[in-house]
C-alpha cells in the first residue's frame, strides 16, 4: 500500500515538473512572439513613414540632381564636422564638378551669405596632396586657391564662390552630402 502511494506521488511530481517545463516554454514562446511583434511593428512603422515621406531628401536638406545637401547652423572644427555628417548618414561635401560647385555657392548665397563652410577636402600630411575624405583626388579645377601657411593640418572650405584652405582646427560651418532617394514610382 505504502509503495503504491509512493509511486503515485512520484508520478504526480513528474507530471508537475513536465507542466512547469511546458509553462516555461510557453512563457518563452510568448516573450519571443511579443519581441517579434515589436520588430514587426517597428518595421511597418519605418516602411509607412518612408512611403509617406517619399521626398528624395530629408527635411531641411537641399536637393540637386542625385545629391542632398545639408548646410549646418553650427560651427565646428573639420574633424567634428566629419563626425556630425556621418551621424546623419552622410559625409562632408565632396565636389565632383564645376556645375556642383556653382550650385553650392549659389545656394549658399541665397541661404546665408559669405561665410566659411568646411568640405571633405584635406591635405595629406606627408605628400602635401589634396585628397577628398574617401581618398580620391579632386579634379585640377577644384583645388583650393591659396595654400594655408599653417604648420598644422590643412583642410578645405568653401567661401563665396571659392575653394580655400585653412587650419583644420579652426571653427566653421560645414556642408554634408548624401545620395538622394530614388523614386520607386
Amino acid at each position: 500500500k505504502l509503495l503504491q502511494v509512493s509511486t503515485i506521488a512520484m508520478q504526480q511530481q513528474e507530471k508537475l515538473i513536465q507542466q512547469e517545463r511546458a509553462l516555461l516554454n510557453f512563457t518563452e514562446w510568448k516573450r519571443s512572439c511579443a519581441l517579434q511583434m515589436k520588430y514587426c511593428q517597428a518595421f511597418m512603422q519605418n516602411s509607412l513613414s518612408s512611403a509617406h515621406n517619399s521626398s528624395p531628401c530629408p527635411n531641411n536638406w537641399i536637393q540637386n540632381r542625385e545629391s542632398c545637401y545639408y548646410v549646418s547652423e553650427i560651427w565646428s572644427i573639420w574633424h567634428t564636422s566629419q563626425e556630425n555628417c556621418l551621424k546623419e548618414g552622410s559625409t562632408l561635401l565632396q565636389i565632383e564638378s564645376k556645375e556642383e560647385m556653382d550650385f553650392i555657392t549659389g545656394s549658399l548665397r541665397k541661404i546665408k551669405g559669405s561665410y566659411d563652410y568646411w568640405v571633405g577636402l584635406s591635405q595629406d600630411g606627408h605628400s602635401g596632396r589634396w585628397l577628398w575624405q574617401d581618398g580620391s583626388s579632386p579634379s585640377p579645377g577644384l583645388l583650393p586657391a591659396e595654400r594655408s601657411q599653417s604648420a598644422n593640418q590643412v583642410c578645405g572650405y568653401v567661401k563665396s564662390n571659392s575653394l580655400l584652405s585653412s587650419n583644420c582646427s579652426t571653427w566653421k560651418y560645414f556642408i554634408c552630402e548624401k545620395y538622394a532617394l530614388r523614386s520607386s514610382v
Partner: nanobody
C-alpha cells in the same frame, strides 16, 4: 537596441596588417552609418573611418591610404582592413553605429598593439 561585437585585434609588428570585424545585431542597411573609432591611452577617442548606409566612405587623414573600411550587408558586418600599421596606431578600436535617429551605439572595443 543595436548590439555590436568587435573582433580581430591583437599584437602585430610595425609594417604588418590586421583586419577588424564588427558584427551587428541588426540589418546594417537600416542604419544611418557605421564607423570605427580608436582611443589611445591618455588620448581622446577619434574617428578612424566611417561608411554610410548608402555606401559613402570617410577616413581620418592619419589613416587614409593605409586603412580600408568595407561592409557585408548579408552578414551584418563592417570591416576595417589596416595595412602598414605604425606604433602610433596602437589603441583600443571601437565599432559604432548610428541609427536612423542618429543615436550612437558602441561595441566593447578590441585592442590593437603595434610593436616597433
Amino acid at each position: 537596441q543595436v548590439q555590436l561585437q568587435e573582433s580581430g585585434g591583437g599584437l602585430v609588428q610595425a609594417g604588418g596588417s590586421l583586419r577588424l570585424s564588427c558584427a551587428a545585431s541588426v540589418n546594417i542597411d537600416t542604419l544611418n552609418s557605421m564607423a570605427w573609432y580608436r582611443q589611445a591611452p591618455g588620448k581622446q577617442r577619434e574617428l578612424v573611418a566611417g561608411i554610410t548606409g548608402s555606401g559613402q566612405i570617410t577616413y581620418a587623414n592619419s589613416v587614409r591610404g593605409r586603412f580600408t573600411v568595407s561592409r557585408d550587408n548579408a552578414k551584418s558586418t563592417v570591416y576595417l582592413q589596416m595595412n602598414t600599421l605604425q606604433p602610433e596606431d596602437t589603441a583600443v578600436y571601437y565599432c559604432a553605429a548610428y541609427d536612423r535617429s542618429s543615436t550612437p551605439y558602441w561595441g566593447q572595443g578590441t585592442q590593437v598593439t603595434v610593436s616597433s
